[in-house]
Interface confidence: medium
Amino acid sequence: QAGPLPKPTLWAEPGSVISWGNSVTIWCQGTLEAREYRLDKEESPAPWDRQNPLEPKNKARFSIPSMTEDYAGRYRCYYRSPVGWSQPSDPLELVMTGAYSKPTLSALPSPLVTSGKSVTLLCQSRSPMDTFLLIKERAAHPLLHLRSEHGAQQHQAEFPMSPVTSVHGGTYRCFSSHGFSHYLLSHPSDPLELIVSGSLEDPRPSPTRSVSTAAGPEDQPLMPTGSVPHSGLRRHWE
């Protein structure tokens, strides 16, 4: 008796974070025995779409010509072989940016920081939001995701980083969002260049994701602080 069919691989090109109006292609890669591919979207009637495999039959393409709110969400795909349907793929989260006006990102006390000292990145939105994300250019994932606990909305969120090393240097952007859809984000803020000057020899480098924040978890979230009420936003790694 053969075991369950291996799960397919699901990905998006050019990526899983897409600006409003831009095109995106979702790929599902299974095996050469695949006869049909199915794409399911969470909270939508299944199947969301079906496609015949492209030669040599080990993958299928699902095209979204123009990204809108309706396409944002969590997807899984399956393939059918002569012996039945595969296990579901790992989920793909397709996020749309441009749903809200862009926030402002600033650095306190300054974007020019000496190694070994501290800095706070402040993301401010014009209207109250309950989710804020901080993104570092060329990082594989969002660095920090601040989300309101009780739906309490804020105009800003603080991302403290301490102690700063060369790892923290680079270009940051932030997004804001409403909790009712984590897949709809604002336009990105203008980029903020964080420049770290070295007064001490840099400690051994850690991965880009290991940006230490506020001295407590190095690469895991902390309570946002300062102007954000204690009962408000909490940090989550995504």
């Epitope: 301490s162 400690p203 051994r204 850690s206 506020a214 978890p217 690469d219 300062g226």
Partner: antibody
Framework: EQSVESGGDLVKPEGSLTLTCTVS?????????ICWVRQAPGKGLEWIGC???????TYYGSWAKGRFTISKTSSTTVTLQMTSLTAADTATYFC???????????WGPGTLVTISS | ELDMTQTPASVSEPVGGTVTIKCQAS??????LAWYQQKPGQRPKLLIY???TLESGVPSRFSGSGSGTEFTLTISNLECADAATYYC????????????FGGGTEVVVK
């Protein structure tokens, strides 16, 4: 979540001692700043230094550099190695975990180190 | 070197009164400042971080203010349980420091 210090002892001057901080309720599979703070009898708090359990980066107070070494020894333990001890190093040593704005929310009960001949 | 200076060293106030403790940094620490309470024989307890954010479970009688080099911890409507030593601590600079903590202020409640 808690941290507990161990290894406190009576040591002769110029001797060495290693203290261990053992955490429970969390582990260093997520990266934390674990720091050591000491308090001499009847005196104030003194920051010794910290280690990032993910990166291995260490920071020390200027007076502690060279004589004190903080290391991560397992997914739940951090040590503080102390050398060339003098009577001035007599203190309760606390292991703490970093929190928001580099504050210390989680403190161990402390372990007493006495340096005397 | 960045140093933290706390004043006064000791203060005595009656129950119901108000105590103000000051902490001065020798150079700016932005708002990277925390306050702790320590009672004899006990470990310190975090009260305030980020200069003004009250730690969960801490009574609102405690408040923190300030930014840069000057910080204040205020305890209003003093209770007997507030008798303790209070410390400030900067978290801004990890590199060139002798001690991150201030020298402490003993609060006596009459």
């Amino acid at each position: 979540e808690q941290s507990v210090e161990s290894g406190g002892d009576l040591v002769k001057p110029e001797g060495s001692l290693t203290l261990t901080c053992t955490v429970s309720g969390f582990s260093f599979s997520s990266s934390y700043w674990i720091c050591w703070v000491r308090q001499a009898p009847g005196k104030g708090l003194e920051w010794i230094g910290c280690i990032g359990t993910g990166s291995g980066s260490t920071y020390y107070g200027s007076w502690a550099k060279g004589r004190f070494t903080i290391s991560k020894t397992s997914s739940t333990t951090v040590t503080l190695q102390m050398t060339s001890l003098t009577a001035a190093d007599t203190a309760t040593y606390f292991c703490v975990r970093g929190a928001g704005y580099s504050s210390y929310r989680l403190w161990g009960p402390g372990t007493l180190v006495t340096i005397s001949s | 070197e960045l140093d933290m200076t706390q004043t006064p060293a000791s203060v005595s106030e009656p129950v119901g009164g108000t105590v103000t403790i000051k902490c001065q940094a020798s150079e700016s620490v932005s708002n990277w400042l925390a306050w702790y309470q320590q009672k004899p024989g006990q470990r310190p307890k975090l009260l305030i971080y980020g200069a003004s954010t009250l730690e969960s479970g801490v009574p609102s009688r405690f408040s923190g203010s300030g930014s840069g080099t000057e910080f204040t911890l205020t305890i209003s409507n003093l209770e007997c349980a507030d008798a303790a030593t209070y410390y400030c601590q900067q978290g801004y600079d990890w590199d060139n420091i002798d001690n991150a903590f201030g020298g402490g202020t003993e609060v006596v409640v009459k």
